[in-house]
Amino acid sequence: GSERTCCPVNWVEHERSCYWFSRSGKAWADADNYCRLEDAHLVVVTSWEEQKFVQHHIGPVNTWMGLHDQNGPWKWVDGTDYETGFKNWRPEQPDDWYGHGLGGGEDCAHFTDDGRWNDDVCQRPYRWVCETELDKASQEPPLL
């Protein structure tokens, strides 16, 4: 495949990545699938600088990111190491709260109204952010 050198229409370029910001809500798994179908992934936050960029674009709205612990350990969807990576949890979070009454705890991470992170029930219909890296091989065939 060819290398992607510029962002698709309606995506925002920042630091060699492209970002797409939803304006509707989906459950985490559906948001994750949406990004994958766009040859992208839910946003993976690797620095304070990237955190500020995303926060600026989403505003004070609950928004899914590509971090979950649905199988036990916290994992970023692109394989970035959680343990050594950037974290921006709200105080007292993550708390795997069971009191919501929906069954199970809270396994998916989202940006809260102040940008810091919280874990929540993955079925909640929050907005989401997709990310894809420039210079990575595209799934599309090259133009001849």
């Epitope: 612990d69 649905q70 199988n71 036990g72 350990p73 916290w74 959680y82 343990e83 974290k87 949890w89 105080p91 007292e92 979070q93 993550p94 708390d95 795997d96 709260w97 069971y98 009191g99 069954g103 199970g104 705890g105």
Partner: antibody
Framework: EVQLVESGGGLVKPGGSLRLSCAAS????????MNWVRQAPGKGLEWVSS????????YYADSVKGRFTISRDNAKNSLYLQMNSLRAEDTAVYYC????????WGQGTLVTVSS | DIQMTQSPSSLSASVGDRVTITCRAS??????LGWYQQKPGKAPKRLIY???SLQNGVPSRFSGSGSGTEFTLTISSLQPEDFATYYC?????????FGPGTKVDVK
């Protein structure tokens, strides 16, 4: 590599107290809820208590409520179980385990309550 | 509280056999259930989480299925190292509850 190591078990008389510890390593301890599970000799597994990552939420089995206290020290990557008013039926191997889905377990520590 | 029952409580099988263990919940727990293997004198080990997802490093001969109130653990071809006791666990709501266990021994 995730590791959980329990300690503090031993022989104690009925009515006595014991404090179990679980030393955690290989993961960001404060990001995970933790649990105590026990197994009486020759019996099945019994969930005892859980605590969320920042100690906001704490849960106990009815069989230990009011007698056992779960706590954690995230600075020391350690989980604790303070056991008071011990009874013969508390005799068991006590395991610590990570998260609600119990993905990693320690090797266990034996608590024997006998006169 | 949610009660978990397991059947059978024990079974005898031979290497190569297909083994199925059933776990039932007293109320619906979606897919919030795990399966654990325990050998004598050892800590339990997670095999399956979320009813059907295989734990990393666990052989593919183990599989889980089910949702709601009825769940199964299947070992497609029993190996010598699989003789052990198997427990299900619901972590849908507190108090968490284990099934009573199924002991798989040599026929």
């Amino acid at each position: 590599e995730v590791q959980l190591v329990e300690s503090g078990g031993g022989l104690v008389k009925p009515g006595g107290s014991l404090r179990l510890s679980c030393a955690a390593s290989g993961f960001t301890f404060s990001s995970y809820s933790m649990n105590w599970v026990r197994q009486a000799p020759g019996k099945g597994l019994e969930w005892v208590s859980s605590i969320s990552g920042s100690s906001t939420y704490i849960y106990y089995a009815d069989s230990v409520k009011g007698r056992f206290t779960i706590s954690r020290d995230n600075a020391k990557n350690s989980l604790y179980l303070q056991m008071n008013s011990l009874r013969a039926e508390d005799t068991a191997v006590y395991y610590c385990a990570r998260v609600a889905a119990f993905d990693y377990w320690g090797q266990g520590t034996l608590v024997t309550v006998s006169s | 509280d949610i009660q978990m029952t397991q059947s059978p409580s024990s079974l005898s099988a031979s290497v190569g056999d297909r083994v199925t263990i059933t776990c039932r919940a007293s109320q619906g727990i979606r897919d919030i259930l795990g399966w654990y293997q325990q050998k004598p004198g050892k800590a339990p080990k997670r095999l399956i989480y979320a009813a059907s997802s295989l734990q990393n490093g666990v052989p593919s001969r183990f599989s889980g299925s089910g949702s709601g109130t009825e769940f199964t653990l299947t070992i497609s071809s029993l190996q010598p190292e699989d003789f052990a006791t198997y427990y299900c666990l619901q972590y849908h709501s507190y108090p968490f509850t284990f099934g009573p266990g199924t002991k798989v021994d040599v026929k």
